[in-house]
């Protein structure tokens, strides 16, 4: 199930959206211009993210439109900040057995969550659905981002970063796929799949096994169809 990873190559255009999914709804994590973080039922310009992989499973998450880093305070509140503080704005990424991703602060141990409660991450735990994320490639036309065209300079090492300040166009390493026991239950995110062609739909990423008459591997959360 490698294509569900938020850390994908340039085939996803660099921009992704993190969303929680229950059997009948989904919320996309968005970082507003004022730094407020919440969820929206659909992709928005503020839910378009760049996720940069660092060593040892750490990631840095940036809101492309707000140009703010996703950060966490000591109480577990998440917010967007223009200032990058390594202690508050780096998260440990882990893929659960069910193929969903969780992000937690190595400093404060709280999970990134769209729910209001603050819960610490414990290895082996089953977090609530609003603390488990999937990723979806950006479906919003880039013109909606209305990013000003940077000034042209003589081509240099600095030129690349100025034209792409958030590194959204640079390929990134793939993460380890989820266990095979789950991957057969989950759809890929190819361009012709429902996940790629449902920018505004209600996700039906249920936690119950949709295969008639049986239950899947422990911890797996197979998808039902989109509505």
């Amino acid at each position: 199930y490698p294509n569900a990873s938020p850390l994908l190559g340039s085939s996803w255009g660099g921009l992704i959206h993190l969303y929680t999914a229950t059997a009948r709804n989904s919320y996309h994590l968005q970082i507003h211009k004022n730094g407020h973080v919440d969820g929206a039922p659909h992709q928005t310009i503020y839910s378009a993210l760049m996720i940069r992989s660092e060593d040892a499973g750490f990631v840095v998450i940036t809101g492309v439109m707000s140009r703010r880093y996703l950060c966490m305070d000591f109480r577990g509140n998440i917010f967007g900040s223009h200032y990058f503080d390594p202690e508050n704005c780096r998260f440990q990424h882990q893929t659960l057995e069910n193929g969903y991703d969780v992000y937690h602060s190595p400093q404060y141990h709280f999970l990134v969550s769209l729910g209001r409660a603050k819960r610490a991450f414990l290895p082996g735990m089953n977090p609530p659905p609003y603390s488990q994320f999937l990723s979806r490639r950006n479906e919003i036309p880039l013109i909606h981002f209305n990013t000003p065209i940077p000034r042209r300079h003589t081509r240099s090492a600095e030129d690349d970063s100025e034209r792409d300040p958030l590194n959204v166009l640079k390929p990134r390493a793939r993460m380890t796929p989820a266990p095979a026991s789950c991957s057969q239950e989950l759809p890929s995110a190819e361009d012709n799949s429902p996940m790629a062609s449902d920018p505004l739909g209600v996700v039906r990423g249920g936690r119950v096994n949709t295969h008639a008459g049986g239950t899947g591997p422990e911890g797996c959360r197979p998808f039902a169809k989109f509505i």
């Epitope: 929680t20 229950t22 059997a23 009948r24 709804n25 919320y27 919440d38 969820g39 929206a40 039922p41 659909h42 769209l114 729910g115 209001r116 409660a117 819960r119 089953n126 977090p127 609530p128 659905p129 609003y130 505004l200 739909g201 209600v202 249920g206 936690r207 119950v208 509505i227």
Partner: antibody
Amino acid sequence: QVQLVQSGAEVKKPGASVKVSCKASGYTFTNHYMHWVRQAPGQGLEWMGIINPISGSTSNAQKFQGRVTMTRDTSTSTVYMELSSLRSEDTAVYYCARDYVDAFDFWGQGTMVTVSS
Amino acid sequence: AIQLTQSPSSLSASVGDRVTITCRASQGISSALVWYQQKPGKAPKLLIYDASSLESGVPSRFSGSGSGTDFTLTISSLQPEDFATYYCQQMYDDFNFGPGTKVDIK
């Protein structure tokens, strides 16, 4: 402040349809799913369905498949629930409720629908 | 679908009593459980979300606990305005409610 204001009580005959409205205010309408929940007299709460406010996509409890239609009008921040082929067992109070990721945090005042011949 | 059962279905108590209501899920739902209070003729009111988090404005005598399949709502010292029906709801894979527990005056 967040408010969900529902339409008034209705009396319908068996076989007819009823359409209940729920007007939202005090928040960004398109940022929260809306649910419909009903409660028959003296009974518990029964979840009916959910609507995505931006796309209009819906998902209903299996019990109501084919009989319930949920729609929304983003220009007026209003959601609608239409229940068709009414029977006496559909006599209930119908509530709309806002989804806040981890709970239904705001509810409408309820609309009493009476089905009687 | 995940089923929720509540016990007791009704109870009689006096002002000042400690009241405990349990909700059991047919399979694990992590902490994705909500408690509501409903009074006759009124819409349900959110009390507890994420199993144990108190909704803003709700008195601290209400508390929730549990995770996985077993959950508890506790009213530490019952007040006259607490006589009502209490419902649990799961937000894990669907949105179904428990059958309710009616708390009335002894």
